[in-house]
């Protein structure tokens, strides 16, 4: 079955936007005016995952690019990366677990928990211009809350 997808942008709770930083990394920084066009547009796909009352499994691809956010172990630590895929086969309903995030939505604030590594979340730093990463703490210094803006397809 074709997977259902929506185009969107994400901003962290400090209103930092996400932009490309090199070919395989995202960073978060404040953008204004025309610079807003730099922010990445995600294709959020609704995929199969664990049954849960408050978690919706999604995959986050970069619109019109064959890149997906994925979670892998690097030096024994859960790590966020942009992974290149074969566009003929992606997105798909049954995404490999490393590509799946549990979208948790409370009062229009979103968290993205790694399905592969429970309690690890897509995170940004308080500081400007730092990489988007996978963080193992919630409610600390690092930011794990995002807002979503729909983008016309």
């Amino acid at each position: 079955a074709p997977v259902r997808s929506l185009n969107c942008t994400l901003r962290d709770s400090q209103q930092k936007s996400l932009v490309m930083s090199g070919p395989y990394e995202l960073k978060a920084l404040h953008l204004q005016g025309q610079d807003m066009e730099q922010q990445v547009v995600f294709s959020m796909s609704f995929v199969q995952g664990e049954e849960s009352n408050d978690k919706i499994p999604v995959a986050l691809g970069l619109k019109e690019k064959n890149l997906y956010l994925s979670c892998v172990l690097k030096d024994d630590k859960p790590t966020l990366q942009l992974e290149s895929v074969d566009p003929k086969n992606y997105p798909k309903k049954k995404m490999e677990k490393r590509f799946v995030f549990n979208k948790i939505e409370i009062n229009n604030k979103l968290e993205f928990e790694s399905a592969q590594f429970p309690n690890w979340y897509i995170s940004t730093s308080q500081a400007e211009n730092m990489p988007v990463f996978l963080g193992g703490t919630k409610g600390g210094q690092d930011i794990t809350d995002f807002t979503m803006q729909f983008v016309s397809s």
């Epitope: 079955a1 074709p2 259902r4 929506l6 185009n7 609704f46 199969q48 049954e51 919706i56 999604v58 309903k93 979208k103 939505e105 229009n108 729909f150 983008v151 016309s152 397809s153």
Partner: antibody, heavy 120, light 107 residues
Framework: QVQLVQSGAEVKKPGASVKVSCKVS????????IEWVRQAPGKGLEWIGE????????NYNEKFKGKATITADTSTDTAYMELSSLRSEDTAVYYC?????????????WGQGTLVTVSS | DIQMTQSPSSLSASVGDRVTITCKAS??????LSWFQQKPGKAPKSLIY???RLVDGVPSRFSGSASGTDYTLTISSLQPEDFATYYC?????????FGQGTKLEIK
């Protein structure tokens, strides 16, 4: 509370068009799909299509492509469905309903329905 | 298209009875299944979504379950207001498809 209020009943001649409206209140219009469903007299429910007003995404049942055109006006929180080239078999009650953008919650809220009668 | 085969098409029961209505999907629908109640001249009313989650305000006598591609709506103890027509809906794949309906009548 959430409300979906549809336009009133219509009587149309074969070959004419009709535009049914669905005005929503009580939630953020752009974050919910608006679904359109029809029910012919004495029959079951049939899905026509859906629109996500915040994005302009539209999905149709192939059966209704060319028959139904779904639009939305985010300035008035109103969705529309226009039916063209009406025939007697298009006589039905047309309902709008809603589902959250991530599809999780099902068709939770429904309009009261709009009866469209096609008769010469 | 995914076919939703609903059974029985009609059912006679008494107040206090336990009744079950089944929908069989022609393929996997990843638990994207809802149940609706409709009374004559009224819009459908949502009862259950994602197989077993009760819509706010729906009495706990209604429940849903799944086994493979078979989905069941159970009313544990029928009340007079429960006599109506019930529909299932799959919303996993386009076009979304409804079951043919089950008319629940008073015996």
């Amino acid at each position: 509370q959430v409300q979906l209020v549809q336009s009133g009943a219509e009587v149309k001649k074969p070959g004419a068009s009709v535009k049914v409206s669905c005005k929503v209140s009580g939630y953020t219009f752009s974050r919910y799909w608006i679904e359109w469903v029809r029910q012919a007299p004495g029959k079951g429910l049939e899905w026509i299509g859906e629109i996500l007003p915040g994005q302009g995404n539209i999905n149709y049942n192939e059966k209704f492509k060319g028959k139904a055109t779904i639009t939305a006006d985010t300035s008035t929180d109103t969705a529309y469905m226009e039916l063209s080239s009406l025939r007697s078999e298009d006589t039905a009650v047309y309902y709008c309903s809603t589902i959250y953008y991530d599809y999780d919650q099902g068709f939770t809220y429904w309009g009261q329905g709009t009866l469209v009668t096609v008769s010469s | 298209d995914i076919q939703m085969t609903q059974s029985p098409s009609s059912l006679s029961a008494s107040v206090g009875d336990r009744v079950t209505i089944t929908c069989k999907a022609s393929q996997d629908i990843d638990r994207y299944l809802s149940w609706f109640q409709q009374k004559p001249g009224k819009a459908p009313k949502s009862l259950i979504y994602r197989v077993k989650r009760l819509v706010d305000g729906v009495p706990s006598r209604f429940s849903g379950s799944a086994s493979g591609t078979d989905y069941t709506l159970t009313i544990s103890s029928l009340q007079p207001e429960d006599f109506a027509t019930y529909y299932c809906l799959q919303y996993d794949e386009f076009p979304y498809t409804f079951g043919q309906g089950t008319k629940l009548e008073i015996k």
